[in-house]
Interface confidence: low
């Protein structure tokens, strides 16, 4: 950005700047971030017996250690490894649900279909969902004023690197048939630059994953097109096939009916297409 150019010209390091000059383009750390993370951790471990052994104070310490005192444009996946280790969790085969640009519906689905899991149904995803955080170089403070924006400032920021790290791990541990929910209302139904397109697709393990099944969610009630024929879906099929993973695609024409039929599969209207 322009600010970066000025600093580069003056050969001033970010950490040498007065505090008021360290303004990033993105919004600051979510209010009460530490307490929110800890409260979510305690709540998660209460509800998930298999994670009762997790010490939430240690989880917070590892989370904090990944970004506190570090220059927030120089965060690495390595920084998050202690946290990833503490949050190790496995999903049964055939039960992984990935999503791209359609988070709400994916979460509504796993709330009903309790034996399927998105990343945000796992401990680490649950802790960080919808939160923003960053620190400051050489201080122990959390920056509540501003954090780096992925486009305007830098991609190696604490939030982006976190999601890249945990998404990679989530994809690596998937097995069986993996499902992905895609937004059929977007111009790019499959976007190579999304987390799904740039991280998860490339980290599915062919020796463990037999197939990827895409569910393309239609937006309009009268939309009867076969979006599985969309050029971007064909691109996804090509990437997946080259990785020796089979590819299937389904149109979900009526997402409302789709959810209703997940809740009540015996409903007579669910025997027809959705």
């Amino acid at each position: 950005s322009g600010l970066n150019d000025i600093f580069e010209a003056q050969k001033i390091e970010w950490h040498e700047l007065p505090r008021w000059r360290q303004q990033w383009s993105g919004s600051g750390t979510t209010s009460r971030f530490p307490e929110t993370v800890l409260a979510r951790c305690v709540k998660y471990t209460e509800v998930h017996p298999e994670m009762r052994h997790v010490d939430c104070q240690s989880v917070w310490d590892a989370f904090k250690g990944a970004f506190i005192s570090k220059y927030p444009c120089n965060i690495t996946e390595e920084d998050y490894q202690p946290l990833v280790k503490l949050g190790t969790q496995t999903v049964p085969c055939n039960k992984t649900l990935l999503w791209s640009r359609i988070k709400d519906l994916a979460h509504q689905f796993t709330q009903v279909q309790r034996d399927m899991f998105t990343l945000e149904d796992m401990l680490l995803g649950y802790l960080a969902d919808d939160l923003t955080w960053c620190g400051e170089f050489n201080t122990f403070e959390i920056n509540y004023q501003s954090c780096p924006d992925w486009r305007k400032d830098c991609s190696n920021n604490p939030v982006s690197v976190f999601w890249k790290t945990v998404s990679r791990r989530f994809a690596e541990t998937a097995c069986g048939v993996v499902h992905v929910m895609l937004n059929g209302s977007r111009s790019k139904i499959f976007d190579k630059n999304s987390t799904f397109g740039s991280v998860e697709v490339h980290n599915l393990q062919p020796e463990k994953v037999q197939a990827l099944e895409a569910w393309v969610i239609h937006g309009g009630r009268e939309d009867s097109r076969d979006l599985c024929q969309d050029p971007t879906i064909k691109e996804l099929e090509s990437i997946i096939s080259k990785r020796n993973i089979r590819f299937f695609c389904k149109n979900i024409y009526r997402p409302d009916k789709f959810l209703q039929c997940v809740k009540n599969p015996e409903d007579s209207s669910c025997l027809s297409g959705i």
Epitope: T30, S31, R32, F33, P34, E35, T36, V37, L38, A39, C41, V42, K43, E46, C56, Q57, W60, D61, I142, Y144
Partner: antibody, heavy 117, light 111 residues
Framework: QELVESGGGLFQPGGSLALTCKAS?????????MCWVRQAPGKGLEWIAC???????TDYATWAKGRFTISKTSSTTVTLQMTSLTAADTATYFC???????????WGPGTLVTVSS | DIVMTQTPSSVEAAVGGTVTIKCQAS??????LAWYQQKPGQPPKLLIY???TLASGVSSRFKGSGSGTQFTLTISDLDSADAATYYC?????????????FGGGTEVVVK
């Protein structure tokens, strides 16, 4: 791990006081919600205020706003300041630790504050 | 502020008996409710959190249930050591506030 309150005693109406909650066996540099609760003689528990030790953000019962101030004063102490004391403030004041989700699993023994002329 | 209404204010039961204490919240609080036991001259002791989860080291004779606005604490196979005052507490935390409220308390007398 324990909490110990101090600063109680006999105080004049209209006066001020500061109660201290000292933590031992753990550090408030870690993330906890620390709270103050009071109990008038023979009465029930009444929540006063909480502070998040990570963010420093505070929350008060509606009736406590303005006259009570909770603060983290060091890595081992949380303080409750009270002003404009009245006889109705006579109570045992407890501090409690919450590891972050409402489970107040550690309490101090309490300190008695008596407001009387 | 949330108001917690606890009933009854006092209850008497024999050793080996069962006691039920009810707590009603003025607005829905999900399952974010705790129960405490307090004996004279002592601070409260956490019994149950998340409406039904037993705190560490607490006897399984204590059982919490309910969600939303209606909650119940049941003490079965009553022991003389259970004589105490019991309080419910709502703790409907969000990322922006830590509101808490206690019920008025229920004194349990064991005959």
């Amino acid at each position: 791990q324990e909490l110990v309150e101090s600063g109680g005693g006999l105080f004049q109406p209209g006066g001020s006081l500061a109660l201290t909650c000292k933590a031992s066996g753990f550090s408030l540099s870690n993330i906890y919600v620390m709270c103050w609760v009071r109990q008038a003689p023979g009465k029930g528990l009444e929540w006063i205020a909480c502070i998040g030790t990570g963010s420093g953000d505070t929350d008060y019962a509606t009736w406590a706003k303005g006259r009570f101030t909770i603060s983290k004063t060091s890595s081992t102490t949380v303080t409750l300041q009270m002003t404009s004391l009245t006889a109705a403030d006579t109570a045992t004041y407890f501090c409690a630790r919450d590891p972050g989700a409402g489970t107040w699993n550690l309490w101090g023994p309490g300190t008695l504050v008596t407001v009387s002329s | 502020d949330i108001v917690m209404t606890q009933t009854p204010s006092s209850v008497e039961a024999a050793v080996g008996g069962t006691v039920t204490i009810k707590c009603q919240a003025s607005q829905t609080i999900g399952s974010r409710l705790a129960w405490y036991q307090q004996k004279p001259g002592q601070p409260p002791k956490l019994l149950i959190y998340s409406a039904s989860t037993l705190a560490s080291g607490v006897s399984s004779r204590f059982k919490g249930s309910g969600s939303g606005t209606q909650f119940t604490l049941t003490i079965s196979d009553l022991d003389s050591a259970d004589a105490a005052t019991y309080y419910c507490q709502s703790y409907y935390y969000t990322s922006t506030s830590y509101p808490n409220a206690f019920g008025g308390g229920t004194e349990v007398v064991v005959k």
